[in-house]
Interface confidence: low
């Protein structure tokens, strides 16, 4: 498993919510849904009402990082996507409010958001070589690449 690479000297300060109520679809056109209280999974849906709606909050790095750093929250909840380790499912962590400052071990709440055309990638700040990914018969997890699917389409205006 990939070792945690917490950048304890880097501080991330919350700026603002930059996207509300969007859906994430993977390259197989599967939408992210709630599997249970703790975990997410992906499924092909006929009705997108069942898909998880996310909000995206932007953070600014104290080391002037060119990457866009974000937090992912399930809309209208206090549940935040939290990275664990490689091939481990991401967790939904409940917090009373969006963190104003994140540093050290709390960077497992943050992801670098990269876009390539219509493809969106979310790399873990705590594990810079691992992506949010979907995997057949598994939860949404952290993975380095195939066979897991690491690219997503963002569907907006899904309120």
């Amino acid at each position: 498993s990939a070792p945690f690479s917490f950048l304890s000297n880097v501080k991330y300060n919350f700026m603002r919510i930059i996207k509300y109520e969007f859906i994430l679809n993977d390259a197989l056109n599967q939408s992210i849904i709630r599997a249970n209280d703790q975990y997410l999974t992906a499924a092909a849906l006929h009705n997108l009402d069942e898909a998880v709606k996310f909000d995206m909050g932007a953070y600014k790095s104290s080391k002037d990082d060119a990457k866009i750093t974000v937090i992912l929250r399930i809309s209208k909840t206090q549940l935040y996507v939290t990275a664990q380790d490689e091939d481990q499912p991401v967790l939904l962590k409940e917090m009373p409010e969006i963190p104003k400052t994140i540093t050290g071990s709390e960077t497992n709440l943050l992801f670098f958001w990269e876009t390539h055309g219509t493809k969106n990638y979310f790399t873990s700040v705590a594990h810079p070589n691992l992506f949010i990914a979907t995997k057949q018969d598994y939860w949404v997890c952290l993975a380095g690449g195939p066979p897991s699917i690491t690219d997503f389409q963002i569907l907006e205006n899904q309120a």
Partner: nanobody, 116 residues
């Protein structure tokens, strides 16, 4: 009507093994995560293990990790718990439950007694 029927409990010596089964009916078994929880005499409920709907992922309490194995046969609508290297502290009523971490249905339980 959802029904969960546990079986396989009994008296076993320390270090012994048992296999618990849970026959599920009244819901689409393959669509749901399942779990085992237990209640020792005079104590509260303790989560033991959970398994994802496809069986692709499992999770265990630290107290049973390496000794217990959860599995399921979706073609038979049955959940299993293989218990090896049993200890006195494993003595409890074992319940099959529908769900991963929060449960909407439970079985009646099967008693496991570990004693010499």
């Amino acid at each position: 009507e959802v029904q969960l029927l546990e079986s396989g409990g009994g008296l076993v010596q320390p270090g012994g093994s048992l296999r618990l089964s849970c026959a599920a009916s009244g819901f689409t078994f393959v669509r749901y995560d399942m779990a085992w929880v237990r209640q020792a005499p005079g104590k509260g409920l303790e989560w033991v293990s959970s398994i994802y709907k496809s069986g692709a992922l499992t999770s265990y309490a630290d107290s049973v990790k390496g000794r217990f194995t959860i599995s399921r046969d979706n073609s038979k609508n049955t959940l299993y718990l293989q218990m090896n290297s049993l200890r006195a502290e494993d003595t409890a009523v074992y319940y099959c439950a529908k769900g991963w971490a929060s449960f909407d249905y439970w079985g009646q339980g099967t008693l496991v007694t570990v004693s010499s």
